[in-house]
């Protein structure tokens, strides 16, 4: 992924859906593309743990070979890893399917925090957990990594769910979904579910907990709540989007709207933290400080470096504010917001010396590649990212952590003029989108 | 100081193996891809083999496919190429060039500098 | 595999003189292109990597151009030390393989 301070993931919370399942409103949006309904087969086919990514199972080769896969819509190749390395139980192993070809060819992805090389080639592949159909896709084979694999993560890959702008060596290799659409009936759509922990999960938790859904070609209704609102992908790279205002507990940061976008705005499910461009983070959490100051917190907490703890069930969740993003809506003029948490933004990590404590990380975080809303935000939403019509939608998740006093919430319309411009278009000659690295 | 020395090059009949070693030094070798290119007498160059810096990659050209098997032993700063079922055609000045960086396919991970090669001659 | 065609074959030229030397993809190579120089009985050093990176310790005088499939070495003035068999290398696709070279004489 284009990746400021991006590794493989970048944090995902993962646990066992939470939260009442509010009342259905009626849905007002336009018919959509896919099946409607229920995706009986592909809920709750994500797992992962804390901070280390969601991933779906996935088969590889013929015969099959079993893997679990990242879930990562900050980028867009398919990569497994295919050699033995300390921190993988598994590998795809190519001289052990038939159906591999190799396509003679290296890849190379470095991010800020990790890199990657490996082989193209191309191989069968299906998702036990999802539409019952295989397809020829490319696949980079992981030979050489560093600080990509995470220890204890149970994920031996990623797929990369992105536009193929973005895709390694380049634009030629063909996404996995691309693939996918191309090859069978299934509609150009999937939607996310990620589901946080809420809390701190211990080991034997982590690796039981279902961490969410990936539905894929359409919307189920059980994920979500009230009715979804759409905004326009900018750009079929990434999944850009425009963010037109942030709010900090209704109060207006009041900064010029590409300050917002500096330089892009992407949604992704491989990024742990709400990343935003310095000016803004510094703006946000001075006012997150002000509207929290009933506590004091060091510095290093609001950097994510050190943790807040607080005896077992008494988190102050009221003195933290909501936070607000309103996006560019589909009609002219008109924006929604989005809203999250505390229960978004503090991320519940184990704390060894203290495990009667509930312990946190502010996961809201500096970033100089763009605001980057990843699992932070996406735990709070059931995300629709519609490729058939260049939209992504949210809507309030079944799923997500809450209290009796707030919800996180998905609301419009609001009159917003000259949207547009609040897009940074970046410079013809900026070569900046050739790098690779984000966290 | 970046050094390579190729040792192990010689006359060997048809059919016949060799074993070449490059030995490293002036900078942490396992750091570094490695590869093997070679010149016959009088002509141009071609790529042999190469391996990443952990050994975990390996490739090969198409003519030395199952024939030939590189290989390194970071701890004593050698890289090798072992040489079975050697023909004529692989007659030639073998070299060991130093890569970049750990990785094969990175930008900028060129080979170079290069060692001053071995000798080998296939010939009954 | 890719062939790299290098032409000419031989330039004779005097030093002093502008050298472009082209090198030829039968497919697309991105950038993924270098260029070596071999002088006799030594072994090949990199000038250009990345089709257009002079590597560390190479003169000004040499440069580098192209991508996709036509590339092209550029001497700006040939100095003495400059006459030698000039290789060009592709590893975006495996095998990696070199041009059949180009060696510039003194004329």
């Known amino acids: 992924t284009h990746l400021g301070i991006r590794l493989p993931l970048r944090s995902g919370l993962a646990g066992p859906p939470l939260g009442l399942r509010l009342p259905r409103e009626t849905d007002e949006e336009s018919e959509e593309p896919g099946r409607r309904g229920s995706f009986v087969e592909m809920v709750d086919n994500l797992r992962g743990k804390s901070g280390q990514g969601y991933y779906v199972e996935m088969t590889v080769g013929s015969p099959p070979q079993t893997l679990n896969i990242l879930v990562d819509t900050g980028s867009s190749n398919f990569a497994v890893g295919a050699a033995p390395h300390p921190f993988l139980h598994r590998y795809y192993q190519r001289q052990l399917s038939s159906t591999y070809r190799d396509l003679r060819k290296g890849v190379y992805v470095p991010y800020t925090q990790g890199k990657w090389e490996g082989e193209l080639g191309t191989d069968l592949v299906s998702i036990p957990h999802g539409p019952n159909v295989t397809v020829r896709a490319n696949i980079a084979a992981i030979t050489e990594s560093d600080k990509f694999f995470i220890n204890g993560s149970n994920w031996e890959g990623i797929l990369g769910l992105a536009y193929a702008e973005i895709a390694r060596p380049d634009d030629s290799l063909e996404p996995f979904f691309d693939s996918l659409v191309k090859q069978t009936h299934i509609p150009n759509i999937f939607s996310l579910q990620l589901c946080g922990a809420g809390f701190p999960l211990n080991q034997t938790e982590a690796l039981a907990s279902v961490g969410g859904s990936m539905i894929i070609g359409g919307i189920d209704h059980s994920l979500y709540t009230g009715r979804l609102w759409y905004t326009p992908i900018r750009r079929e790279w990434y999944y850009e989007v425009i963010i037109v205002r942030v709010e900090i507990n209704g109060q207006d940061l009041k900064m010029d709207c590409k300050e917002y976008n500096y330089d892009k705005s992407i949604v992704d499910s491989g990024t742990t933290n709400l990343r935003l461009p310095k000016k803004v983070f510094e703006a946000a959490v001075k006012s997150i400080k002000a509207a929290s100051s009933t506590e004091k917190f060091p510095d290093g907490f609001w950097l994510g470096e050190q943790l807040v703890c607080w005896q077992a069930g008494t988190t102050p969740w009221n003195i933290f504010p909501v936070i607000s993003l309103y996006l560019m809506g589909e009609v002219t003029n008109q924006s929604f917001r989005i809203t999250i948490l505390p229960q978004q933004y503090l991320r519940p990590v184990e704390d060894v010396a203290t495990s009667q404590d509930d312990c946190y990380k502010f996961a809201v975080s500096q970033s100089s590649t763009g605001t980057v809303m990843g699992a932070v935000i996406m735990e709070g939403f059931y995300v629709v990212f519609d490729r058939a019509r260049k939209r992504i939608g949210f809507a309030v998740s079944a799923c997500h952590v809450h209290d009796e006093f707030r919800t996180a919430a998905v609301e419009g319309p609001f009159v917003t003029a000259d949207m547009e411009d609040c897009g940074y278009n970046i410079p013809q000659t900026d070569e900046s989108t050739l790098m690779t690295g984000r966290a | 100081e970046v050094q390579l020395l190729e040792s192990g090059g010689g006359l060997v009949q048809p059919g016949g193996s060799l074993r070449l070693s490059c030995a490293a030094s002036g900078f942490t070798f396992g750091s570094y891809a490695m590869s093997w290119v070679r010149q016959a007498p009088g002509k141009g160059l071609e790529w042999v083999s190469a391996?990443?810096?952990?050994?975990?990659?390996?490739y090969y050209a198409d003519s030395v496919k199952g024939r030939f098997t590189i290989s390194r032993d970071n701890s004593k700063n050698t890289l090798y190429l072992q040489m079975d079922s050697l023909r004529a055609e692989d007659t030639a000045v073998y070299y060991c060039?130093?890569?970049?960086?750990?990785?094969?396919?990175?930008?900028?991970?060129?080979?170079?500098?290069w060692g001053q090669g071995t000798l080998v001659t296939v010939s009954s | 595999e890719i062939v790299l065609t290098q032409s000419p074959a031989t330039l004779s030229l005097s030093p002093g003189e502008r050298a472009t030397l082209s090198c030829r993809a039968s497919?697309?190579?991105?950038?993924?292109l270098a260029w070596y120089q071999q002088k006799p009985g030594q072994a090949p050093r990199l000038l250009i990597y990345d089709a257009s990176n002079r590597a560390t310790g190479i003169p000004a005088r040499f440069s580098g151009s192209g991508s996709g499939t036509d590339f092209t070495l550029t001497i700006s003035s040939l100095e003495p030390e400059d006459f030698a068999v000039y290789y060009c290398v592709q590893r975006s696709n495996f095998p990696w393989t070199f041009g059949g070279g180009t060696k510039v004489e003194i004329k």
């Open positions: 497919q697309s190579v991105s950038s993924y």
């Open positions: 060039a130093k890569g970049g960086s750990q990785w094969l396919y990175a930008p900028g991970s060129w080979f170079d500098p």
């Open positions: 391996t990443s810096g952990s050994g975990g990659s390996t």
